[in-house]
Amino acid sequence: EPPTACSDKQYLHDGQCCDLCQPGSRLTSHCTALEKTQCHPCDSGEFSAQWNREIRCHQHKYCDPNLGLRVQQKGTSETDTICTCEEGWHCTSEACESCVLHRSCSPGFGVKQIATGVSDTICEPCPVGFFSNVSSAFEKCHPWTSCETKDLVVQQAGTNKTDVVCGPQDRLR
């Protein structure tokens, strides 16, 4: 009596259990009562990641430099190529099909988290006591200058975009 289910790494074909092709190969012919499944290694530039019965391997992903992409990890017969973005850029999606330029944090904001190949810059407002006077993808907020440690007094208050201005302690009001 023909089987109705096959074991793991097998598949049912014409009433019999055939072996699946292993990762890195593709199906060339199904098994018969006399012959085992025939498989063939994936060609260069192709891969198959799982036990399979596919007649074609998958093409390796192309990391298009025109889209800001570069190869992070070269593909093998069992794995796809992994793309990442050029320095200063990050992926627009998890699949990393294209890249966009890292965001800069505006004056009044500092970098909370520096961008990576897969995530954009995260900015945060500078709190009281800190400032940022530049647009940057790397700089955190800087603390206001402590005038007292220089034996000076605050002549002008700091803001989230400007440092305090220190001056001599000779001005009475």
Partner: antibody, heavy 122, light 113 residues
Framework: QVQLQQSGAELMKPGASVKIPCKAT????????IEWVKQRPGHGLEWIGE????????NYNEKFKGKATFTADTSSNTAYMQLSSLTSEDSAVYYC???????????????WGQGTLVTVSA | DIVMSQSPSSLAVSVGEKVTMSCKSS????????????LAWYQQKPGQSPKLLIY???TRESGVPDRFTGSGSGTDFTLTISSVKAEDLAVYYC?????????FGGGTKLEIK
């Protein structure tokens, strides 16, 4: 110990100006911001702004620019807030307060005056 | 401006009960540079000036009874009174000092049953 002394109450006519004093004792007056806070019944607390007596440097809440003016006299350790063109909306208790730290870490208000009640009435 | 919202606006509890009140900010008060939350809590008893209870969201001011506890981070904060006393009758305000203008919540009025 740190103390902030305010005047009791002021009854003012609409259109007039009032200058509210806040006398500080128990610390180096010039080195710490003096904060000003408004409290109207049912309106909670509103920050008006701050003055650093050593330099006269100020920060104002945009809402109170043109209404409030801060000054400080380091010889008498007194900060002042002048309110101009008074209307009934300015009737409130006005507090002066001092942050715990000096000027560079944000202000939570550790010390408070007892408040000055300003009533604006024709 | 950062908007501070407090809830409930009032609550009535019996002496000995635990009470919690909430304060929410319209933007995060946590600064990653020092991992501090720029939030303070004040108590204002009838006819008195406000009194500082808590700063940096959870640091109790010197002399404040340990039944008062501040907690929370980012945009959601809580003031808890573990066992209310009759003397705790007051309005409680939160305040952000992350950015100018400093802003206060509308207050939570605590009444004693």
């Amino acid at each position: 110990q740190v103390q902030l002394q305010q005047s009791g109450a002021e009854l003012m006519k609409p259109g007039a100006s009032v200058k509210i004093p806040c006398k500080a004792t128990g610390y180096t007056f010039s080195s710490y911001w003096i904060e000003w806070v408004k409290q109207r019944p049912g309106h909670g607390l509103e920050w008006i702004g701050e003055v650093l007596p050593g330099s006269g440097s100020t920060n104002y809440n945009e809402k109170f620019k043109g209404k409030a003016t801060f000054t400080a006299d380091t010889s008498s350790n007194t900060a002042y807030m002048q309110l101009s063109s008074l209307t009934s909306e300015d009737s409130a208790v006005y507090y002066c307060a001092r942050p715990y730290y000096r000027y560079d870490v944000g202000a939570w208000f550790a010390y408070w005056g007892q408040g000055t009640l300003v009533t604006v009435s024709a | 401006d950062i908007v501070m919202s407090q809830s409930p606006s009032s609550l009535a509890v019996s002496v000995g009960e635990k009470v919690t009140m909430s304060c929410k900010s319209s933007q995060s008060l946590l600064y990653s540079g020092n991992q501090k939350n720029y939030l303070a809590w004040y108590q204002q008893k009838p006819g008195q000036s406000p009194k500082l209870l808590i700063y940096w969201a959870s640091t109790r001011e010197s002399g404040v009874p340990d039944r008062f506890t501040g907690s929370g981070s980012g945009t959601d904060f809580t003031l808890t009174i573990s066992s209310v006393k009759a003397e705790d009758l007051a309005v409680y305000y939160c305040q952000q000092y992350y950015s100018y203008p400093y802003t206060f919540g509308g207050g939570t009025k605590l009444e004693i049953k």
